[in-house]
């Protein structure tokens, strides 16, 4: 009886099970009762990453420098090229089809997580006792200066954007 289902790495065609082509190869002709599936390796700059019956290989992704992209990992016959962004930029999506400049954290906010090629800067508000007085993609919130350890007193309270101002203690006469 002709099969209705086939084993793993096979496909059903013309009432018979044919072997799929291995990753890195494309289908030239289906199997017959006399011959196995005929497959051919993908060409230069092409790939197929699964067991398949595709008659055409996929083109490797192009990392367009005009979009801020560069090659992170060169493609093979079995894998696509992986793009990433130039320094200071990150991908706009998981597919990394274009890049945008890393976001800076405004004064009053510090960097919680520095941006990577695939993720943007994560900012956090500076909590009480910490400040950031610059717009930066790298700077964390800094702790207020401890006047006491310097044998000084707070002359002006700190904010999330400014450090405390220390001054000499008033001498009792």
């Amino acid at each position: 009886e002709p099969p209705t289902a086939c084993r793993e790495k096979q496909y059903l065609i013309n009432s018979q099970c044919c072997s799929l082509c291995q990753p890195g190869q494309k289908l030239v002709s289906d199997c017959t009762e006399f011959t196995e599936t005929e497959c051919l390796p993908c060409g230069e700059s092409e790939f197929l990453d699964t067991w398949n019956r595709e008659t055409h290989c996929h083109q490797h992704k192009y990392c367009d420098p005009n979009l801020g992209l560069r090659v992170q990992q060169k493609g093979t016959s079995e894998t696509d090229t992986i793009c990433t962004c130039e320094e200071g930029w990150h991908c706009t999506s998981e597919a990394c089809e274009s890049c945008v400049l890393h976001r800076s954290c405004s004064p009053g906010f510090g960097v919680k997580q520095i941006a990577t090629g695939v993720s943007d800067t994560i900012c956090e508000p500076c909590p009480v006792g910490f400040f950031s007085n610059v717009s930066s993609a790298f700077e964390k919130c800094h702790p207020w200066t401890s006047c006491e350890t310097k044998d000084l007193v707070v002359q002006q309270a700190g904010t999330n954007k400014t450090d405390v101002v220390c001054g000499p203690q008033d001498r009792l006469r």
């Epitope: 030239v28 002709s29 199997c31 017959t32 009762e33 006399f34 011959t35 196995e36 005929e38």
Partner: antibody
């Protein structure tokens, strides 16, 4: 027991035609692809033609394409090879074979075709 | 067309010896290769399919190996009835082709 019995061979003049038959028994004929393979005297094996189990698909090498026709009658459990415009180089023993697991798993005893004037 | 080249053309050995027959394909055929044996005056018979898979009823002394372009048929210890001609055949693509054969003869 699987049996393949060829017939129809003999001496024939160049340019003439001949039809070979292969009577199959011992298996469900209509479930198997079939082929013809030939062997010139003292030489190796050469594939001549194949036909799918249903008879819809036929396959030939370039050197016999257009001169040979493979066919089958599943109701009679018989395989045929029609050979036209015969040449001296067609002289050979012609074997009928069954395709099992993409191999020629059973062979007939062969029938000798001699093309000579 | 895929060309199969068998070597040696003739192998002269004594009963009990090990026989190693080679079949080389002109391009990769994965494991899509069969081996056949033909004794004088007889029809060929299937020995090995898919390069290394044994066939029911064939003695265990016959084994096949290889993949891609290089294949080997090994007869571990020759019996008198093993002296014959051996053919490889590819079924990777049309046209189906056979090697020219290796004759294993008694030394």
């Amino acid at each position: 027991e699987v049996q393949l019995v060829e017939s129809g061979g003999g001496v024939v003049q160049p340019g003439r035609s001949l039809r070979l038959s292969c009577a199959a028994s011992g298996f469900t004929f209509s479930n198997y692809g079939m082929s013809w393979v030939r062997q010139a005297p003292g030489k190796g094996l050469e594939w001549v033609a194949s036909i799918s189990s249903g008879g819809d698909d036929t396959y030939y090498p370039d050197n016999v394409k257009g001169r040979c026709t493979i066919s089958r009658d599943n109701s009679k459990n018989t395989l045929y090879l029609q050979m036209n415009s015969l040449r001296a180089e067609d002289t050979a023993v012609y074997y009928c074979t069954r395709a099992g697991g993409k191999a020629m798993d059973y062979w007939g005893q062969g029938t000798l075709v001699t093309v000579s004037s | 067309e895929i060309v199969l080249t068998q070597s040696p053309a003739t192998l002269s050995l004594s009963p009990g010896e090990r026989a190693t027959l080679s079949c080389r394909a002109s391009q990769s055929i994965r494991d899509n290769l069969h081996w056949y044996q033909q004794k004088p005056g007889q029809s060929p018979r299937l020995l090995i399919n898919y390069a290394s898979q044994s066939i029911s009823g064939i003695p265990a002394r016959f084994s096949g190996s290889g993949s891609g372009t290089d294949f080997t048929l090994t007869i571990s210890s020759l019996e008198p009835e093993d002296f014959a001609v051996y053919y490889c055949q590819q079924f990777n693509s049309w046209p189906l082709t056979f090697g020219q054969g290796t004759k294993v003869e008694i030394k």
